[in-house]
Every structure is written in structure tokens, then in C-alpha cells.
Interface confidence: low
């Protein structure tokens, strides 16, 4: 039975041209985490498994860097970053876990961040 | 539909080499693991190399380290096992097969249908 | 030989329930959930059950995997016809990073 609840940054938002942390917590599970993959819509943006430890996609290598922890940074932050991210736990034994991020780019120098929130 | 198609497969002399392809469709090729596995004539399955999401981490099973070359093209959405030194010990169905995970092992959830290779004089 | 041991056959009637058993050691199974395959002669080997007990979507819930310690079983409850295939257990080797599979057990339905 997956007891497990994934706490994540929630709804959040930066400036275009500046930078933005995505994280995920895993918490009320003993369940060991295997890997963890951070994706957008259907595309892969990095992965930080267990053994191997981080990789990030070709395609992402530039803007993107890993950390801290288990999350992610963003760079150089565009318009078109604007969007849903997930952070997918693999986890043994209780298998997946989904935690889902929603970034907005703004052109304006406003910019806050949401409240944090739990997917179970 | 997500699907794998295995071609190259045929007759080849021991000692000669041979290039496998898998045709992938129906989902995003360049965001998962690929796997090789074969099955000799009446015996079970054998795992043969894997290759990370991105080409760049790769392992091999004992029997076919050194002779054999696990690549894949994202662009072109296809899987390679480059066959080197063929031995008769060598003729099975091979097939390419997806993992869930990118980057390590978690399971292979689709399966082509396999091509076969058989190593003979 | 395989590094995962399975017992070469198993069976059954219709409606009964089997067990499948997978033994390996502390650097595979000790670490790694186990994955089941199904093999219908003629056709390409199919997920049963993967990270230890999930099953994919379109499994029937009369399968069921479990695992302890450094060995794993696949149950069949209310065993049907279209049963009778050959099972492999697999699971990755973190020492050796190698994927290592069971020889297999054929499961005939009587």
C-alpha cells in the first residue's frame, strides 16, 4: 500500500531572464527512492537516480542544473518555460510517485511564489 | 500505438557481423531506456545490453561483452545492436524492448516481436 | 546456469491457485524489486508484474507477486487456460550491472 505524499513548491512564478528552484519532497513512506525524474509535459528535463547519480538531457544541458538535493534549477528563463512540471519518484517497494509543479514566466518584475501544498 | 519493430536479422557465417535495428513509434523514443534480449531455439531468455535514455550509459551481459555494440539514434527513433565475431552460440530471436525508467533498469513494458539470427556454416 | 533459480515446471486445474518461486542473492534480489514475464509459445515475452507487486494496466488481478529477503513468487489465483505459458522472473544486479533473468518455469494448465 503506498503511503507516501510528495510535497512540492506548488504554483510558483520568476521573472523572464532569472532562475527558479523546482522541488519535490517524498515524506510518511520508508519506501526507498530509486530514482527520480523531473519532466515537462511529455519531455524529460533530468534525472537524479540512486546509483548513477544525475543526468541531465542533451537538450536541457544548458539551462538546467541539478539541485539542491533532489530538485532542480532552472536558468535563463523564457516564456515558454512557462508550464506544468512533475517530479516522478520511483520508489521500492510502494512503486510511483507524482508531484506536480505549475511555472509561470513573467515578463514584469512580479513575481511570487504560492503556497506549498500535498499530492497524495 | 506504441510499438517496436525488429529487423536485420538472417543467415550469417560464425565469424561474419551483423547490425539488428528497432524501429520505434508511438511514444517519446529519446525519454526511456532500451534493452536487447534473445532467445536461443527452445531455451529461455537472455538478457543481452541496455542503453540509457541519451546513449550514454551502457552494459552488457558477460557472454557478449566486447563483440557486441548497444547504440541508438533519437533522431531517427531507433535502437542498434551492432553483432561482431558471430558464434553459432549466438542464433536466437532477438528482441529490443522498452524500460520505464531512462536511465536504469525497472522493467522492460513493451516488447517487439523479435527477429531472428542464425549463426551457421 | 542462471544466477535467479525457478523450478523448471508447475501446474494445475482450472480455478486452483499456483505459486511460482524465484530465488537469487544479496547483490540482485537483496536490493532490486523483482519483475515476472509471460510467455506464450510463439509470441513475444509480456510484463506481468514489475517492482515486486504492481501490476501493468490490462494484468488481471488473479496475478500477484510478492518477495522477501533474496527470493520472490508469482501467485495465479483462479488459474485459467489461457494461463499456460512459460514465466521468467528478472531482476537487475547492482554489482554486477548486469539484468539477470530466471530459466524460466512452464506452467501447464491440466
Known amino acids: 500500500m503506498m503511503t507516501g505524499t510528495i510535497e512540492t513548491t506548488g504554483n510558483i512564478s520568476a521573472e523572464k531572464g532569472g532562475s527558479i528552484i523546482l522541488q519535490c519532497h517524498l515524506s510518511s513512506t520508508t519506501a526507498q527512492v530509486t530514482q527520480v525524474n523531473w519532466e515537462q509535459q511529455d519531455q524529460l528535463l533530468a534525472i537524479c537516480n540512486a546509483d548513477l547519480g544525475w543526468h541531465i538531457s542533451p537538450s536541457f544541458k544548458d539551462r538546467v542544473a541539478p539541485g539542491p538535493g533532489l530538485g532542480l534549477t532552472l536558468q535563463s528563463l523564457t516564456v515558454n518555460d512557462t508550464g506544468e512540471y512533475f517530479c516522478i519518484y520511483h520508489t521500492y517497494p510502494d512503486g510511483t510517485y507524482t508531484g506536480r509543479i505549475f511555472l509561470e514566466v513573467l515578463e514584469s518584475s512580479v513575481a511570487e511564489h504560492g503556497a506549498r501544498f500535498q499530492i497524495p | 500505438e506504441v510499438q517496436l519493430v525488429e529487423t536485420g536479422g538472417g543467415l550469417i557465417q560464425p565469424g561474419r557481423s551483423l547490425r539488428l535495428s528497432c524501429a520505434a513509434s508511438?511514444?517519446?523514443?529519446?525519454?526511456?531506456?532500451m534493452h536487447w534480449v534473445r532467445q536461443a531455439p527452445g531455451k529461455g531468455l537472455e538478457w543481452v545490453a541496455v542503453i540509457s535514455y541519451a546513449g550514454e550509459v551502457k552494459y552488457y551481459a558477460d557472454s557478449v561483452k566486447g563483440r557486441f555494440t548497444i547504440s541508438r539514434d533519437n533522431s531517427k527513433n531507433t535502437l542498434y545492436l551492432q553483432m561482431n565475431s558471430l558464434r553459432a552460440e549466438d542464433t536466437a530471436v532477438y528482441y529490443c524492448a522498452r524500460d520505464p525508467l531512462p536511465l536504469h533498469y525497472y522493467g522492460m513494458d513493451v516488447w517487439g516481436q523479435g527477429t531472428t539470427v542464425t549463426v551457421s556454416s | 546456469q542462471s544466477a535467479l533459480t525457478q523450478p523448471r515446471s508447475a501446474s494445475g486445474n482450472p480455478g486452483q491457485r499456483v505459486t511460482i518461486s524465484c530465488s537469487g542473492s544479496?547483490?540482485?534480489?537483496?536490493?532490486?524489486?523483482v519483475n515476472w514475464y509471460q510467455q506464450i509459445p510463439g509470441t513475444a515475452p509480456k510484463l506481468l508484474i514489475y517492482s515486486q507487486n504492481q501490476r501493468p494496466s490490462g494484468v488481471p488481478d488473479r496475478f500477484s507477486g510478492s518477495q522477501s529477503g533474496t527470493s520472490a513468487s508469482l501467485t495465479i489465483s483462479g488459474l485459467q487456460s489461457e494461463d499456460e505459458a512459460e514465466y521468467f522472473c528478472a531482476v537487475w544486479d547492482d554489482i554486477g550491472r548486469v539484468l539477470q533473468l530466471g530459466g524460466g518455469t512452464q506452467l501447464a494448465v491440466l
Open positions: 544479496s547483490s540482485n534480489m537483496g536490493r532490486r524489486p
Open positions: 508511438g511514444f517519446t523514443f529519446s525519454s526511456y531506456a
